[in-house]
């Protein structure tokens, strides 16, 4: 019995659902009562899911698996694995027995995008050309381990004094911290690129350092010019700094973070102590760095609703303020492609191809192409629906008349992350069925 599975590994984002495709060719008169279907882990032989004695025996794998029962009789023995975890990575074997017996193994490659790197500088005040500084680039909750590259403002690699560490958390996701020690020139831009080798996703961070003395007078409060981009569910640092004068003590400091538009209080430090979070208990100051002029705010478990402008007020004897923008983002999943109708297709038939990508933010841009790179702009309808967390599911539908064969590709772009997710379907031969049967 010939059992067919994809040659390439199935790539699935952590937290999304994955389909491990497996198919066989049922003979005429085949009934599900004859079928024994077993999915197991290839290496350990641990049972994952089974269908025997004419019925679904259910999941033996943390209740996160399901079969496509309505498609089994047509030879579709695929397995749906829900809420993928890092620990799921590996090979799964699909055993099919009717009268004959066949099996094949499919690999699951788990991936998670790295967050936009946050950049920190130490020391971060009174910098002069010739000073040695430490620049730290931190990117969170990615998988598998990242590749990290440093560049100067002209794109030249900085390979000198770099130390990179990667630590896995309890879910197996990696936090990467890369530290560059560098001697300052008159000014300079230092860029860090964190690459996910499986997703081929690059996350960029950069910091521009202009060594200079702070002017006297009002407190000069410094924040990043560009919006801080934070992935949903990760922590974000809204950087804010001031230059304390000699003899400065925290007893003199009044620090207030508030929402720029509504003036809602977010966090404050007054009368020599941290007054705590007034914003859903998800904010914190870097108390051990405050005396050095670091008034940055840590915002935990970022949500879509956090997007907007935050103002950092610093008062010592003088007063200063500046606003920093938070841009929230979430990567779109690899699109799933469906075809309707999906059986006995012939050239000239009109089909509907649906490209679906999930849980991204902000709204996506969707593009369709044929197999020669030509845009398919004709009969396309794209809808985007926000869920209760504000994340968008995008569904783009293309109606097209089939040629003798053809490839139809869908590109879902996250405009903030500049992340592209691709899906494609190739329709060949006549007549045919989708997905292709063994």
């Amino acid at each position: 019995l010939e059992v067919q599975v994809p040659e390439d590994p199935v790539v699935a984002l952590v937290g999304t659902d994955a389909t491990l495709r497996c198919s066989f060719s049922p003979e005429p008169g085949f009934s599900l009562a004859q079928l024994n279907l077993i999915w197991q882990l290839t290496d350990t032989k641990q049972l994952v899911h089974s269908f025997t004695e004419g019925r679904d025996q259910g999941s033996a794998y943390a209740n996160r698996t399901a079969l496509f029962l309505d498609l089994l009789a047509q030879g579709n023995a695929s397995l749906r694995l829900q809420r993928v975890r890092v620990a799921d990575e590996g090979s799964f074997t699909c055993f099919v027995s009717i009268r004959d017996f066949g099996s094949a193994a499919v690999s699951l490659q788990v991936a998670a995008p790295y967050s936009k790197p946050s950049m920190t500088l130490e020391p971060n005040k009174d910098l002069r050309p010739g000073d040695t500084v430490t620049i730290t680039c931190s990117s969170y909750r990615g998988y598998p381990e990242a590749e990290v590259f440093w560049q100067d403002g002209q794109g030249a690699p900085l390979t000198g004094n770099v130390t990179t560490s990667q630590m896995a958390n309890e879910q197996g996701l990696f936090d990467v911290h890369s530290v560059l020690r560098v001697v300052l020139g008159a000014n300079g831009t230092y860029s860090c690129l964190v690459r996910n080798p499986v997703l081929q996703q690059d996350a960029h961070g950069s910091i521009t350092i202009t060594p200079q003395r702070s002017p006297t007078g009002a407190v000069e409060v410094q924040v990043p010019e560009d919006p801080v981009v934070a992935l949903v569910g990760t922590d974000a640092t809204l950087r804010c700094s001031f230059s304390p004068e000699p003899g400065f003590s925290l007893a003199q400091l009044n620090l207030i973070w508030q929402l720029t538009d509504t003036k809602q209080l977010v966090h404050s430090f007054t009368e020599g102590r941290d007054q705590g979070s007034a914003y859903a208990n998800r904010t914190a100051l870097f108390l051990d760095l405050l005396a050095q002029g670091n008034a940055s705010l840590r915002l935990q478990r970022v949500r879509v609703a956090d997007e907007g402008s935050f103002t950092c007020f610093v008062s010592i004897r003088d007063f200063g303020s500046a606003a920093v923008s938070l841009q929230v983002a979430a990567p779109y999943s690899k699109p799933s492609m469906t075809l309707e109708p999906n059986k006995d297709l012939r050239p000239g038939d009109t089909v509907t191809i649906t490209c679906s990508s999930y849980r991204g933010y902000p709204e996506a841009e969707v593009f369709w192409q044929d197999g020669q790179g030509a845009p398919l702009t004709g009969n396309v309808t794209t809808s985007q629906m926000a869920n209760e967390q504000g994340l968008f599911d995008v569904h783009s539908v293309l109606r097209v008349v089939l040629g003798a064969n053809g490839t139809y590709s869908c590109l879902v772009r996250n405009p903030v992350l500049q992340q592209d997710a691709h899906g494609s379907v190739t329709i060949t031969g006549q007549p045919m069925t989708f997905p292709p049967e063994a």
């Epitope: 020669q372 590709s409 592209d420 494609s424």
Partner: antibody, heavy 121, light 106 residues
């Protein structure tokens, strides 16, 4: 070596037609679309249209609709561009180019050497 | 139609200069390609799929994207870089080119 070799220069009278050929070699002719791009003296690049040599599907820029005809001969791996009702502003270098790559990233990776068409009375 | 507007149209610079050429699309594009053309020659592929250097293109060339604005940067101009550069999209019909930026020796 992948190559597109175009026919030689042409001088034409206003109102007449011109047919430029583009012979492909070094790759499977039916696997990629052939596009035609023209460049008037001292001007930029202007897309005219393309043909899929396999299906013979064509698409033309609105400006040239009804005046340009793109054809392809699979047996000789040659694409043709015919432009009718010529006027003096059609004086230009005409290029054929292969649109190549892999889904979803495509670009003109090979260009013909160009054919100069002069329209003059 | 998606219009591509390049700026500047002409740029005079010296060897060793850092130069930027901008291509602004009238609406969002899935990707942008760039071509280099020298007088009397056919265009050559230079950068494809927004930021990938074509074969043989030196690493001093790079592209950054902000919204619908694509910026081609040459970090340190070399004599062989003086040419005309065109951007191109085919995210929607018709395929369009920018009007070109001519990079001349100062």
């Amino acid at each position: 070596e992948v190559q597109l070799v175009q026919s030689g220069a042409e001088v034409k009278k206003p109102g007449s037609s011109v047919k430029v050929s583009c012979k492909a070699s070094g790759y499977s002719f039916t696997s990629y679309t052939i596009h035609w791009v023209r460049q008037a003296p001292g001007q930029g690049l202007e897309w005219m249209g393309y043909i899929n040599p396999n299906s013979r599907n064509t698409d033309y820029a609105q400006k040239f609709q009804g005046r340009v005809t793109l054809t392809a001969d699979k047996s000789t791996s040659t694409a043709y561009m015919e432009l009718s009702s010529l006027r003096s502003e059609d004086t230009a270098v005409y290029y054929c180019a292969r649109y190549s790559g892999s889904t979803p990233y495509w670009y003109f990776d090979v260009w013909g050497q160009g054919t100069t068409v002069t329209v003059s009375s | 139609d998606i219009q591509l507007t390049q700026s500047p149209s002409f740029l005079s610079a010296s060897v060793g200069d850092r130069v930027t050429i901008t291509c602004r699309a009238s609406s969002s594009v899935s990707y942008m390609n760039w071509y280099q053309q020298k007088p009397g020659k056919s265009p050559k592929p230079w950068i494809y799929a927004t930021s990938n250097l074509a074969s043989g293109v030196p690493s001093r060339f790079s592209v950054s994207v902000s919204g619908t604005e694509h910026t081609l940067t040459i970090s340190s101009l070399q004599p062989e870089d003086f040419a005309t550069y065109y951007c191109q999209q085919w995210s929607s019909n018709p395929l369009t080119f920018g009007q070109g930026t001519k990079l001349e020796i100062k």
